[in-house]
């Protein structure tokens, strides 16, 4: 039967026994700025290509053991989330991997910047359909990744990011204080903001959305056919990029302002319960958690 | 995310170098009154000292960067420092990522074209 | 273009081993694993296993039972699928075939068991 | 596992359409998205005509189409031609490995 998550934002039309909108986001390619992944696995093979991009520190402590699979799966999972064949959200989209987090899931301002760089140089060397960015990943607040971010969402990139795992203001996080990126929380089956043991989902104004971001159903790096479930605003932002990717490729013209427009409309408004955000940030937190469009763009959406 | 909104720069630490001297006999040294700033990440923990973005002004060029970075390279070989050009940026930010002393901060927030030296920092997968 | 290229035929004793290649090219190797499936005369198709290019992982049949062996060679962009102690029920036309979702085959190999 | 189940063979005249179907059960045909269906000549290696339960690649004529429903693909061809006799395998995920069907044996009267 069809995963929690991805019946959450598919409109009740679709809501058969499975989720199945042919050949979604096919015109649109989607960036993933992770970890390495394992691109062979049966979920996504022939779906993303890894590039020869890769800019991440050493790995700490002097007794780390670099096992491939740990070090391929928190990338491996978004990478099903974004456009696996069975349990992901745009399954037409194309994906190109570059390595900016090393196999504990680190990395640097300074690796993304020139990641970013290398999707912007890769762009203008070779002009495709509409490009969709998603970085998965936060560090503290920085005025130089949110100034590179703010310079590829002007070349028409779509940046999607996650709001971060500190159950904090997410202005105080990059990039997802950059005003250009879409910036993604979590939420669970039951629409309430997301905990991560002692943490959970940021929030706050610097917050677009919501989408799905526990129990998340996706590739796992273990073996070639294997599944796993992880749950962050990772996984939230994977399903924002997903969706983005179906609505840039129906309509490969949006502007980022009128993507971001569609997006809020096809929200669920007001199903997440506020009270587990700080009083002062609940009127500043948008109740706002990402679906698709409904059945009347299935010509649209489901081409 | 969310746009419309002020920068907010939060518990963001910026250090405000005004460029008072003019040593070094710069040829192209910065306007009068102009100051580059510098930054870090405010969780200690993440901070990376010892790399820093050197960000350059809008419109600079290429040749201007690699200039530039190379005048750092040698104003700090001349006060014993060895830096390492780590990367020069351009097509996004111009710029370059710099391998050094943080005793050279002051110095390089003089160079001509810098807009602001940020520190590097660590990011995690969420 | 994308093509597998298969070794040539074989013809082994019951108990013997065989070992067949193929060469994988015209795509990216990491992007696609490579699935063996097997024919037996005037039989269907079965499926007997898969191997990485990315990291030499393998997902054997569970009819291999220990017999079979798959693996990648990168530099030289070819992977072996070994069948030992074989019997003559192991008569078939062997194909490789791209990734999981098997969009490209190659020619085909012919084994023959016979003593 | 055992194989998906096809009919052993089906006919039909020139012009005419048929479909040929493929059962599983809800570890394999019903429960993934991705079925495939192959067409192979004598002496031929298989070419694969439909993947992921609908999907054409390019350059298989748009007379070939895939559809599910429950446990059951089918693969239905329109216009028969000469050329398209030839046996005809589905294919399924399972949940760590790939189920065949038996084949079905297409004869164009």
């Known amino acids: 039967s069809i995963p929690w998550n991805l019946e959450r934002i598919t409109p009740p039309r679709y809501r058969a026994d499975e989720y199945q909108p042919p050949d979604g986001g096919s015109l649109v390619e989607v960036y993933l700025l992770d970890t390495s992944i394992q691109s062979d696995h049966r979920e996504i093979e022939g779906r993303v290509m890894v590039t020869d991009f890769e800019n991440v520190p050493e790995e700490d402590g002097t007794r780390f053991h670099r096992q491939a699979s740990k070090c391929d799966s928190h990338g491996t999972h978004l990478a099903g989330v974004v456009s696996g064949r069975d349990a992901g959200v745009a399954k037409g989209a194309s994906m190109r991997s570059l390595r900016v987090l090393n196999c504990q899931g680190k990395g640097t301002v300074s690796g993304t910047l020139i990641g970013l760089e290398f999707i912007r140089k890769s762009q203008l060397v070779q002009p495709v359909g509409p490009l969709v960015v998603l970085l998965p990943l936060a560090g503290g607040y920085s005025r130089v990744l949110n100034a590179a971010c703010q310079r590829l969402a002007r070349a028409g990139v779509v940046l999607v990011t996650a709001a971060g795992n500190f159950r904090d203001d997410a202005c105080l996080y990059s990039p997802a204080s950059a005003p250009e990126v879409i910036t993604v929380g979590a939420t669970n089956a039951q629409d309430q903001p997301v905990t991560l043991g002692t943490l959970g989902t940021n929030f706050g104004r610097c917050v677009d959305l919501f989408a799905p971001g526990e129990d998340i159903i996706g590739a796992s790096s273990d073996c070639s056919t294997c599944f796993v479930s992880q749950s962050g605003t990772s996984q939230a932002a994977a399903h924002v990029a997903g969706i983005a990717a179906m609505m840039l490729s129906a309509e490969p013209e949006l502007t980022l302002a009128e993507l971001r427009q569609r997006l809020i409309h096809f929200s669920a408004k007001d199903v997440i319960n506020e009270a587990w955000f700080p009083e002062d940030q609940r009127v500043l937190t948008p109740n706002l958690v990402a679906a698709l469009p409904p059945s009347t763009h299935e010509n649209l959406y489901f081409q | 995310g969310a746009m419309g909104q002020e920068d907010e720069d939060g518990d963001y630490e910026e250090l405000v170098l005004a460029l008072r001297s003019e040593e070094d006999g710069l040829a192209e040294a910065p306007e009068h009154g102009t100051t580059a700033t510098f930054h870090r990440c405010a969780k200690d923990p993440w901070r990376l000292p010892g790399t820093y973005v050197v960000v350059l002004k809008e419109e600079t060029h290429l040749s201007q960067s690699e200039r530039t970075a190379r005048r750092l390279q040698a104003q700090a070989a001349r006060r014993g420092y060895l830096t390492k050009i780590l990367h020069v940026f351009h097509g996004l930010l111009p710029g370059f990522l710099v391998k050094m002393s943080g005793d050279l901060l002051e110095l390089a927030l003089k160079l001509p074209h810098v807009d602001y030296i940020e520190e590097d920092s660590s990011v995690f997968a969420q | 273009q994308v093509q597998l290229v298969q070794s040539g035929a074989e013809v082994k004793k019951p108990g013997a081993s065989v070992k067949v290649s193929c060469k994988a090219s015209?795509?990216?190797?990491?992007?696609?694993?490579i699935s063996w499936v097997r024919q037996a005369p005037g039989q269907g198709l079965e499926w007997m296993g898969w191997?990485?290019?990315?990291?030499?992982?393998?997902n054997y049949a569970q009819k291999l039972q220990g017999r079979g062996t798959m693996t990648t060679d990168p530099s030289t962009s070819t992977a072996y699928m070994e069948l030992r102690s074989l019997r003559s029920d192991d008569t078939a036309v062997y194909y490789c075939?791209?990734?999981?979702?098997?969009?490209?085959w190659g020619q085909g190999t012919t084994v023959t068991v016979s003593s | 596992q055992s194989a998906l189940t096809q009919p052993a063979s089906v006919s039909g005249s020139p012009g005419q359409s048929i479909t040929i179907s493929c059962t599983g059960t809800?570890?394999?045909?019903?429960?993934?998205?991705?079925v495939s269906w192959y067409q192979q000549h004598p002496g031929k290696a298989p070419k694969l005509m439909i993947y992921?339960?609908?999907n054409r690649p390019s350059g298989v004529s748009n007379r070939f189409s895939g559809s599910k429903s429950g446990n059951t693909a089918s693969l239905t061809i329109s216009g028969l031609q000469a050329e398209d006799e030839a046996d005809y395998y589905c294919?399924?995920?399972?949940?760590?490995?790939?189920?065949f069907g038996g084949g079905t044996k297409l004869t164009v009267l």
């Open positions: 075939a791209r990734g999981y979702g098997m969009d490209v």
């Open positions: 191997v990485s290019f990315y990291n030499g992982n393998t």
């Open positions: 294919n399924s995920y399972t949940s760590t490995s790939m189920v």
């Open positions: 992921e339960v609908s």
């Open positions: 015209g795509y990216t190797l990491t992007s696609y694993g």
């Open positions: 809800s570890s394999d045909v019903g429960g993934y998205n991705s």
